[in-house]
């Protein structure tokens, strides 16, 4: 872009990608301004990730306008929770975590009733993702998968999600889970372990779909590396 | 805007091949991560998943009709078809096509539906 | 293949009232779960995708939740628009639609 992203102020709704180290430039939206009176978040917005449902603080130099960059940011990504991003910030824009409750005063996400509690294990958790983590660090960057050809791909395609489950491991389930979660949504607590180990993956998969019976394999990324706390709530979870 | 429109012959005699084709715009299936599916309706009954035809071509079938199902796809008139090789009088329904993602958030969009009889 | 079963296939409920509409699949099916709507004319919209996330332009008195295998679509405040069938469907293992539920003004 030819003029200086660091001067460029947002407001509360603006689309824009989002930069945070060790992550692609994600989608996003402003929720709330500036909070001089905090110190920690004096100058940094908070920033809603699409597809994850997470938030963080971020100032101005890391934040991109989504329109004037959609070409250059939009492309499909490997990481999970990315595409469903792209496809929330053009199709759902408004889009908020269940169970959301602003705890700031410069919120700008219109509240007229509160939301239904969070889906049991819908994982759609929100945190201070800066240098936050769960407590365990599992905010950790997920292992794209390995390409098998060149048309193909990545699994986890919509219809696909189910396949190849042998290495999942089953998740505890929490029958009252519900309202517990819902309380544990306010923008700048950590999540607590217990709600972490009952939620399921953050985001519906995306990627490819596999040809059948394919077994799927994994590779690190090199960047995962503490800077993982510093992403926009991804969490690594192993293939369905 | 994403509007899809589904349109078939109508009526159609059993054993008889048909090729209903839904036309969209808002889109367009050459785009990585888009897909369009089929979906039908027999009168008084729910809803059924056919098939869906992704923009890279690796679809995917309904298994108890896979063998009498073939999708395809113009992309440049933003056009998705599927073909029912041997039509039965069970077929009989309101055929939808609808747009999908990878993305795994649902079918999107809808078309208004169009009715297929299979009558001799 | 996952079998999604609406155990009511139609309910009746006033005006106001909060509503909510089951849905169970035969296996785990991980969130991954829509709901439609269907008015009487045929016309058919996405409410909530991946069990509780609303879909653009979808009024908030709709909700989802659930895991594993059990879902429900709750309606906070029905409305003489609400007056529809309503389909659960599962996208872990292709696509599966639940038998529906119909939804009427008593």
């Known amino acids: 872009m030819s003029r200086s992203n660091r001067q460029k102020e947002y407001k509360c709704g603006d689309l824009v990608f989002a930069k945070m180290k060790g992550y692609p430039h994600w989608p996003a939206r402003i929720d709330e301004m500036p909070e001089a009176a905090v110190k920690s978040t004096a100058n940094k917005y908070q920033v809603f990730f699409f597809g994850t449902h997470e938030t963080a603080f971020l100032g101005p130099k890391d934040l991109f306008p989504y329109e004037e960059s959609k070409e250059k940011f939009g492309k499909p990504n490997k990481r999970k929770g990315f595409s469903e991003g792209l496809w929330e910030i053009e199709n759902n824009p408004t889009v908020k975590a269940s169970g959301y409750q602003s705890s700031q005063k410069k919120s700008c996400v219109e509240e007229p009733e509160p939301e239904p509690e969070a889906a049991e294990g819908d994982g759609d958790k929100k945190g201070n993702a800066e240098g936050s983590s769960d407590e365990e660090g599992k905010l950790v960057i997920d292992e794209p998968a390995k390409e098998k050809n060149e048309k193909g791909a990545l699994k986890r395609r919509a219809g696909d999600l189910l396949e190849d489950s042998p290495k999942r491991p089953k998740e505890a389930e929490n029958p009252e889970g519900e309202e517990k979660e819902a309380a544990t949504l306010e923008v700048e607590r950590p999540l607590p372990m217990e709600v972490e180990k009952n939620s399921t993956p953050s985001e519906p998969g995306s990627g490819r779909g596999p040809p059948q019976e394919e077994e799927e394999e994994e590779d690190e990324e090199e960047e995962a590396t503490k800077e993982d706390a510093e992403a926009p709530g991804i969490r690594d979870h192993e293939s369905l | 805007q994403i509007t899809l429109k589904q349109s078939g012959p109508g009526i159609v005699q059993p054993s008889q091949p048909v090729r209903l084709t839904c036309t969209f715009s808002?889109?367009?299936?050459?785009?990585?991560?888009?897909?369009v599916a089929w979906i039908r309706q027999p009168s008084g009954k729910g809803l059924e998943w056919l098939a869906t035809?992704?923009?890279?071509?690796?679809?995917r079938y309904n298994p108890s009709l896979k063998s009498r199902l073939a999708v395809s796809k113009d992309t440049s008139n933003n056009q998705a078809f599927l073909n029912i090789i041997t039509v039965e009088t069970a077929d009989t329904a309101i055929y939808y096509c609808a747009q999908i993602y990878d993305y795994a958030v649902g079918f999107a969009y809808w078309g208004q539906g169009t009715l297929v009889t299979v009558s001799a | 293949d996952i079998q999604m079963t609406q155990t009511t296939s139609s309910l009746s409920a006033s005006l106001g009232d909060r509503v909510t509409i089951s849905c169970r699949a035969s296996?785990?099916?991980?969130?991954?779960l829509n709901w439609y709507q269907q008015k009487p004319d045929g016309t058919v919209k996405l409410l909530i995708y991946y069990t509780s996330r609303l879909h653009s332009g979808v009024p908030s008195r709709f909700s989802g939740s659930g895991s594993g295998t059990d879902y429900s679509l709750t309606i906070s405040n029905l409305e003489p628009d609400d007056i529809a069938t309503y389909y659960c469907q599962q996208y872990g293992k292709l696509w599966t639609f639940g038998g529906g539920t119909k939804l009427e003004i008593k």
């Open positions: 296996q785990d099916i991980s969130n991954y």
């Open positions: 035809i992704w923009w890279d071509d690796d679809n």
């Open positions: 808002g889109f367009s299936l050459s785009t990585s991560g888009i897909g």
